[in-house]
Interface confidence: low
């Protein structure tokens, strides 16, 4: 109660006190976060000629501007707009690959099928992939101790809002036939609460996107069920159809063989089903 007395007497909000650093439920900012973002940006622009014009210093300044000195439970998509503007990139039609709860396989796929792109193959997704970050209200400090957890603390935290913002943009710019990789091993193959289900599905533009093709990835080698008949897939089909976008679904029974056949399509075993 002594602490409360101090707050009451000075009429200071708890998150304005630098000495009592807010303890959030999530893990803190990734070690060497600024250096990592900058290094990734430099590497990306070196490898992708179409992004060589990007000034990585400006990208970092825009990134830090989105969350530094701001209360980490009150971040908005607006905060990330300067960064989104700097990271503007287009994907050729028919080359967008979305994913839900199966990131590793999606990335393995685009590493082989180099003309298809997940969000993490784009500059902004590449910069932030697997990183955590947050700041503190009214200071220039990065919080390396803890950051807000989406469930336990708040949803409007720097990391969640970033992914919501860039995922929305990624879906909005997609065109032609869009593909999505879904995890057939999960109880909800299509989860309305995932980033794909809550953001990307609703931001595909019917005037640009002719169809969404779902690839349902099977987990077990002996699993021969048609997971395209799963109730959650039917729910996805309903949502997509209502948006005047056609829907197709394919079972990928053997993800290992699937990847192998992407690498070597001429392989005789690839003529049979995968």
């Amino acid at each position: 109660s002594g602490l409360n007395d101090i707050f009451e007497a000075q009429k200071i909000e708890w998150h304005e006190l630098p000495r009592w650093r807010q303890q959030w439920s999530g893990s803190g900012t990734t070690s060497r976060f600024p250096e990592t973002v900058l290094a990734r940006c430099v590497k990306y622009t070196e490898v992708h000629p179409e992004m060589r014009h990007v000034d990585c210093q400006s990208v970092w300044d825009a990134f830090k501007g989105a969350f530094i000195s701001k209360y980490p439970c009150n971040i908005t998509e607006e905060d990330y707009q300067p960064l989104v503007k700097l990271g503007t990139q287009t994907v050729p039609c028919n080359k967008t690959l979305l994913w839900s709860r199966i990131k590793d396989l999606a990335h393995q796929f685009t590493q082989v099928q180099r003309d298809m792109f997940t969000l993490e193959d784009m500059l902004l997704g590449y910069l932030a992939d697997d990183l955590t970050w947050c700041g503190e209200f009214n200071t220039f400090e990065i919080n390396y101790q803890s950051c807000p957890d989406w469930r336990k603390d708040c949803s409007n935290n720097p990391v969640s809002v970033f992914w919501k913002t860039v995922s929305r943009r990624f879906a909005e710019t997609a065109c032609g036939v869009v593909h999505v990789m879904l995890n057939g091993s999960r109880s909800k193959i299509f989860d309305k609460n995932s980033t794909f289900g809550s953001v990307e599905v609703h931001n595909l533009q019917p005037e640009k996107v002719q169809a969404l093709e779902a690839w349902v990835i099977h987990g077990g080698r002996e699993d021969s069920r048609d997971l395209c008949q799963d109730p959650t897939i039917k729910e996805l089909e309903s949502i997509i159809s209502k948006r005047n976008i056609r829907f197709f679904c394919k079972n990928i029974y053997r993800p290992d063989k699937f990847l192998q056949c992407v690498k070597n399509p001429e392989d005789s075993s690839c003529l049979s089903g995968i």
């Epitope: 000495r19 650093r21 600024p34 900058l38 970092w60 530094i68």
Partner: antibody
Framework: QSVEESGGRLVTPGTPLTLTCTVS????????VSWVRQAPGKGLEWIGY?????GTYYANWAQGRFTISKTSTTVDLKITSPTTEDTATYFC??????????????WGPGTLVTVSS | DVVMTQTPASVSEPVGGTVTINCQAS??????LAWYQQKPGQPPKLLIY???TLASGVSSRFKGSGSGTEFTLTISDLESADAATYYC????????????FGGGTEVVVK
């Protein structure tokens, strides 16, 4: 509680030099440390900072020219390839309270580095 | 880079007078600014942090104000012991920036 710099001396250009900041009365697991330098008759120049976690920040101009590292009771500043422009008194300092703050309230007396051929 | 511009470079005032030193940041640094006093042959001494908070043991004759990009250090009732060089410093502990210090202001007490 104190900090003290050591290792300053006359070196020839290009010869790496490591300065050491020895702390006592507080733990480097609770406080970060800044390095600041001052050329003769000139102003203060912030070089860099090491966090309790061991993560480092450097000023733009210092990136690649200096390396900061630490043990449990010392913080080292390595001047990778000194030039005559690096002639200065080098100070280390501890922030006023928490890990990640550049405001230095506890300073060492400084150690003089002279780079000359 | 955030650039700190300090004015004037030098100022001379009599004992009992008042000195005002200005520090301008090239972009907003909120209240993340400190003021230091340095005398010849000595390390700097922290006077004020968070733009206006007096460091422990520092006389209340020293007053810091401002936020965003404009900051001021005011020294009232000047004493001969106040003769020194004063520096502002931006505290923005985010990697990739230039020197966080202003160029310094020499205060001469007549």
């Amino acid at each position: 509680q104190s900090v003290e710099e050591s290792g300053g001396r006359l070196v020839t250009p290009g010869t790496p030099l490591t300065l050491t900041c020895t702390v006592s009365g507080f733990s480097l697991s609770n406080y970060g440390v800044s390095w600041v330098r001052q050329a003769p008759g000139k102003g203060l120049e912030w070089i860099g900072y090491i966090l309790t976690s061991g993560g480092t920040y450097y000023a733009n101009w210092a990136q690649g020219r200096f390396t900061i590292s630490k043990t449990s009771t010392t913080v080292d500043l390595k001047i990778t390839s000194p030039t005559t422009e690096d002639t200065a008194t080098y100070f280390c300092g501890r922030p006023k309270d928490s890990d990640s703050s550049a405001f230095v309230s506890l300073w060492g007396p400084g150690t003089l580095v002279t780079v000359s051929s | 880079d955030v650039v700190m511009t300090q004015t004037p470079a030098s100022v001379s005032e009599p004992v009992g007078g008042t000195v005002t030193i200005n520090c301008q940041a090239s972009e907003s640094i909120y209240s993340n600014l400190a003021w230091y006093q340095q005398k010849p042959g000595q390390p700097p001494k922290l006077l004020i942090y968070k733009a206006s908070t007096l460091a422990s043991g520092v006389s209340s004759r020293f007053k810091g104000s401002g936020s965003g990009t404009e900051f001021t250090l005011t020294i009232s009732d000047l004493e001969s012991a106040d003769a020194a060089t004063y520096y502002c410093q931006a505290n923005h502990m985010i990697v990739i920036y230039g020197n966080g210090f202003g160029g310094g202001t020499e205060v001469v007490v007549k």
